[in-house]
């Protein structure tokens, strides 16, 4: 697995360099997670033909994956920093159960899956420090998450691969939208 941001040899070798600002650290963290997702998607796509599935087929699913909408204030039109930040944190918290599901889904990229999960937890902490209105952030119910996880793990092999593919694709899209929005803050 790649080295998490802030732990690479360049940082160690250059103590005179300006420390990263909060925004730079968040930016770097998201890009690191996106790299991890790319590696996981590569294994998924090599293993099955899920990646050729049409958008229509993927839309017909029973999952409730977080998605950016106009009302969330993260797009250029109607941008609202506070609303958007709440949406990003809430969405990441909702993705956590799906990232847990991914943990036993990879053979050669097992460490990478763990790195994506742990790095997302760190990203949430970074963003929570940045947020002013933490009360507006709803944390998913652990009981609901536990039964969702059980349900996902109960699926047949094809559905598990399809679910894995969809989680990775949706998480990638969510992070890319978050990255664009955070760069405006």
């Amino acid at each position: 697995a790649p080295v998490p941001p802030g732990e690479d040899s360049k940082d160690v070798a250059a103590p005179h360099r300006q420390p990263l600002t909060s925004s730079e650290r968040i930016d770097k963290q998201i890009r690191y997670i996106l790299d991890g997702i790319s590696a996981l998607r590569k294994e998924t796509c090599n293993k099955s033909n899920m990646c050729e599935s049409s958008k229509e087929a993927l839309a017909e699913n029973n999952l409730n994956l977080p998605k950016m909408a106009e009302k969330d204030g993260c797009f250029q039109s109607g941008f609202n920093e506070e609303t958007c930040l709440v949406k990003i944190i809430t969405g990441l918290l909702e993705f956590e159960v799906y990232l847990e599901y991914l943990q036993n889904r990879f053979e050669s990229s097992e460490e990478q899956a763990r790195a994506v999960q742990m790095s997302t937890k760190v990203l949430i902490q970074f963003l929570q420090k940045k947020a002013k209105n933490l009360d507006a952030i709803t944390t998913p119910d652990p009981t609901t998450n536990a039964s969702l996880l059980t349900k996902l793990q109960a699926q047949n092999q094809w559905l598990q691969d399809m679910t894995t593919h969809l989680i990775l694709r949706s998480f990638k899209e969510f992070l890319q939208s978050s990255l664009r929005a955070l760069r405006q803050m």
Partner: antibody
């Protein structure tokens, strides 16, 4: 030819143990989840246990009625799946089938079955 | 658990006519546009044989007299025209998620 062949059935007393075996041939065994399904006149067809792949850490799942008493295992080197049955009850009586689900979940291959009778 | 209710429990149909067996699931068995409902035929002393998978796809070597339909929670198996060889027990099974569950079965006889 894709084939599953069960063995190990017979008569056992309540509270006793028995181990069923299933020999698989004609397909890449290590790529498939494997299951045991049983059938009795009283309960009809009833799924019993499942074992997944090495990449899934050989995850196992059981029907509520057998959990804690039955153990499913596999040996990919010799293409065998097993069902260890302990603390057997009269209601465990039936024909036990070894089945292979295809990738989409359908049980497309079944063995001929082995009969288990639990009686004193 | 997904409960499958099959009806009727037994059915007598004349040769050459249509036999229809229904199966209702306690919750939806479809996802990503596929219905994970399968149909099996079982004759005495034999294991179940796959007839239909994913609600409407014909199993290998199964004659076209057999067809399956339905989505969501309601499914049916049709046999037309009925032949002598079709006398058997028929079961539906959901293959969406474990515990993998079966219907109670339908005994098909010739009238």
């Amino acid at each position: 030819e894709v084939k599953l062949e069960e063995s190990g059935g017979g008569l056992v007393q309540p509270g006793g143990s028995m181990k069923l075996s299933c020999a698989a041939s004609g397909f890449t065994f290590s790529n498939y989840w494997m299951n045991w399904v049983r059938q009795s006149p009283e309960k009809g067809l009833e799924w019993v246990a499942e074992i997944r792949l090495r990449s899934n850490k050989y995850a196992t799942h059981y029907a509520e009625s057998v959990r804690g008493r039955f153990t499913i295992s596999r040996d990919d080197s010799i293409n065998y799946v097993y069902l260890q049955m302990n603390n057997l009850r009269a209601e465990d009586t039936g024909i036990y089938y070894c089945t292979r689900p295809r990738y989409e979940g359908t049980f497309d291959v079944w063995g001929a079955g082995t009969t288990v009778t639990v009686s004193s | 658990d997904i409960v499958l209710t099959q009806s009727p429990a037994s059915l007598a149909v004349s040769l050459g006519q249509r036999a229809t067996i229904s199966c209702r699931a306690s919750e939806r068995v479809d996802s990503f546009g596929i219905s994970f409902m399968d149909w099996f035929q079982q004759k005495p002393g034999q294991p179940p044989k796959l007839l239909i998978y994913a609600a409407s796809n014909l199993g290998s070597g199964v004659p076209a007299r057999f067809s399956g339909s339905g989505s969501g929670t309601d499914f049916s198996l049709n046999i037309h025209p009925l032949e002598e060889d079709d006398v058997a027990m028929y079961f539906c099974q959901q293959s969406k998620e474990f515990p993998w569950t079966f219907g109670g079965g339908t005994k098909l006889e010739i009238k």
